[in-house]
């Protein structure tokens, strides 16, 4: 009988230890949740206040209609230019119209003068077709003027008010593009 009672007592004690452990875990979990909640609230508050105060484009980007453009201050090869744009949540410039081309070339004249700027245009090695980075074809008026004699991959760039082509491994400035933020006010 005594043995039975002590076994029950031991079982109860074990149960108590498990409950204490569970309570400790729960308290820890609750504390962690509270911290995460605090962090999330702070982050959202920051995001909201910066969104409220921000312009449609980030600092040092130029806006035209629904687009924001970034004109690089460094040179890089075409593939690295593409990655640099991705880091900013953008892609290499995709020119959709003559109006956009005119805006870009006009802006470049004001900013930097006559330099070379990579855009998101490349030539398929097999077919020789020019394609934008999303796979779409450029409109007839927006095809590079000269066909590069390079045996390597060929990419498109803007210079003055022309669209030209060059070996993708040459170093040039580049232009990134992303959507402008819509103002909710």
């Amino acid at each position: 009988k005594l043995l039975q009672v002590s076994t029950i007592a031991m079982q109860q004690q074990e149960k108590l230890i498990q409950q204490e452990r569970a309570l400790l875990n729960f308290t820890e979990w609750k504390r962690s949740c509270a911290l995460q909640m605090k962090y999330c609230q702070a982050f959202m508050q920051n995001s909201l206040s910066s969104a409220h105060n921000s312009s449609p484009c980030p600092n040092n980007w130029i806006q035209n209609r629904e687009s924001c453009y970034y004109v690089s201050e460094i040179w890089s090869i075409w593939h690295t230019s593409q990655e640099n744009c991705l880091k900013e949540g953008s892609t290499l410039l995709q020119i959709e119209s003559k109006e956009e081309m005119d805006f870009i070339t006009g802006s470049l004249r004001k900013i930097k003068g006559s330099y070379d700027y990579w855009v998101g245009l490349s030539q398929d090695g097999h077919s020789g077709r020019w394609l934008w980075q999303d796979g779409s074809s450029p409109s007839p008026g927006l095809l590079p003027a000269e066909r590069s004699q390079s045996a390597n991959q060929v990419c498109g760039y803007v210079k003055s008010n022309s669209l030209l082509s060059s070996n993708c491994s040459t170093w040039k400035y580049f232009i990134c593009e992303k959507y402008a933020l819509r103002s909710s006010v």
């Epitope: 982050f43 990655e83 991705l86 880091k87 900013e88 949540g89 953008s90 980075q133 999303d134 959507y179």
Partner: nanobody, 115 residues
Framework: QVQLQESGGGLVQPGGSLRLSCAAS????????MGWYRQAPGKQRELVAA???????TYADSVKGRFTISRDTAGNTVYLQMNSLRPEDTAVHYC?????????WGQGTQVTVSS
């Protein structure tokens, strides 16, 4: 830190399809774009496709019209739908997250196209 977990690789016959997935966790709010790269034996790692947090896409010339990159509504998982696969698509495919200051890589998933 951002952690990336790829899945969906495997062995497929030429002309077949595969869908790769890459799930991001950790500081996902810092990600500006996500992309897929591949590396074939003895070759350099190359960008296959990428998608920005605004949904703009970019593709390597060799996959245009065959591969499609997309993401879920939360933006934390990126998919690469690979159709009309060719033997030259055989490579380890890696997921990459782009932030303003850092790049994060997944462990990679093997894609083998062979009959």
């Amino acid at each position: 830190q951002v952690q990336l977990q790829e899945s969906g690789g495997g062995l497929v016959q030429p002309g077949g399809s595969l869908r790769l997935s890459c799930a991001a966790s950790g500081r996902v709010f810092s990600i500006n774009a996500m992309g897929w790269y591949r590396q074939a034996p003895g070759k350099q790692r190359e960008l296959v496709a990428a998608i920005t947090n605004q949904g703009a896409t970019t593709y390597a010339d060799s996959v245009k019209g065959r591969f499609t990159i997309s993401r879920d509504t939360a933006g934390n998982t990126v998919y690469l739908q690979m159709n009309s696969l060719r033997p030259e698509d055989t490579a380890v495919h890696y997921c990459k997250a782009f932030t303003r200051t850092d790049d994060y890589w997944g462990q990679g998933t093997q894609v083998t196209v062979s009959s």
